[in-house]
């Protein structure tokens, strides 16, 4: 039994880091493998992660962490019984994938303005809370070409757009994702999408 693709890990910079790797053949990850991880810190103890299958030869492990600060560094040991298959380290702050925003809501009752709001996925005491920026994706269910991205570079989790920038009388969907420039993170997953029917009063034309 050998590791074909070494574990790579990403952290949500809160409580979970996810590590994925591939073995050189079909593997029952949960019965054959264990990933031991330990914070490099005085008096810390090793923890064991039981991996799950992620495709035939792929494994994934969700490492639980109390919290994360930028100086944290973990040792990782991948074991198959008594055999050490791989040894490495992981610094969560250098491999951050933020949590996805939640509670995306479209408010359509504000004159002819659409107000989109969502929730920051981090508590106020987490460093990322004040460092997230967002991308909002809006698309038409009727017209695949009607697809747009709005970059929200301010901290407030909201976006206002004129309803008239979208077509009237058809349904749209929106979703939002986040990233943090300070840690050069990857983008989060998209939030669940929300749907609304876009309608607004056409301006009265005088001839």
């Amino acid at each position: 039994m050998k590791v074909l693709q070494e574990p790579t890990c990403v952290s949500d910079y809160m409580s979970i880091s996810t590590c994925e790797w591939k073995m050189n053949g079909p593997t029952n990850c949960s019965t054959e493998l264990r990933l031991l991880y330990q914070l490099v810190f005085l008096l810390s103890e090793a923890h064991t992660c039981i991996p799950e299958n992620n495709g035939g030869a792929g494994c994934v492990c969700h490492l639980l962490m109390d919290d994360v600060v930028s100086a944290d560094n973990y040792t990782l040991d991948l074991w198959a019984g008594q055999q050490l298959l791989w040894k490495g380290s992981f610094k969560p702050s250098e491999h951050v994938k933020p949590r996805a925003p939640g509670n995306l809501t479209v408010h359509t009752n504000v004159s002819d303005t659409l107000l989109l709001t969502w929730s920051n996925p981090y508590p106020p005491d987490n460093y990322l809370y004040n460092h997230l920026t967002y991308a909002v994706n809006i698309w038409s269910e009727n017209d695949p070409a009607d697809f747009r991205i709005y970059n929200v570079t301010y901290l407030e989790p909201s976006l206002r757009i004129a309803a008239s920038t979208l077509k009237s009388g058809i349904s749209y969907r929106a979703r939002v994702r986040a990233w943090a420039q300070c840690y050069n993170t990857t983008w989060s997953e998209w939030s669940p999408s929300t749907k609304w029917h876009n309608s607004y009063r056409e301006p009265f034309e005088q001839h």
């Epitope: 490099v40 810190f41 005085l42 810390s44 109390d66 919290d67 600060v69 944290d72």
Partner: nanobody
Framework: QVQLVESGGGLVQPGGSLRLSCAAS?????MAWFRQAPGKEREAVAA????????YYADSVKGRFTISRDNSKNTLYLQMNSLKAEDTAVYYC???????????WGQGTLVTVSS
């Protein structure tokens, strides 16, 4: 220059309590308490990470000692309850920029547990 000033040591009866303090001139990733009993090697007792939410203890003091830090004052504390004669030692505050926690040391404060 980093300065660590400990206080709070003294003589206490078995089963009693003491609270040690350590004022640090700066913020550190790792802050810890070590102790050295007469004729023994210095050993780690408890440690705490920056942010103050994650704490770590030696097995011999788990459930009896509590480490905490006040980040606004850069002060480290060790609340010691249910003290035993074997807790008698010089207690040292130490801080570090990494998880080893041994970059800078205080001068030590003596804790004596005796009836």
């Amino acid at each position: 220059q980093v300065q660590l000033v400990e206080s709070g040591g003294g003589l206490v009866q078995p089963g009693g309590s003491l609270r040690l303090s350590c004022a640090a001139s700066g913020d550190f990733y790792c802050m810890a308490w070590f102790r050295q009993a007469p004729g023994k090697e210095r050993e780690a007792v408890a440690a705490i990470r920056s942010g103050g939410r994650s704490t770590y203890y030696a097995d011999s003091v788990k459930g009896r000692f509590t480490i905490s830090r006040d980040n606004s004052k850069n002060t480290l504390y060790l609340q010691m309850n249910s003290l035993k004669a074997e807790d008698t030692a010089v207690y040292y505050c130490a801080v570090g920029v990494d998880g080893n926690c041994r970059n800078y040391w205080g001068q030590g404060t003596l804790v004596t547990v005796s009836s």
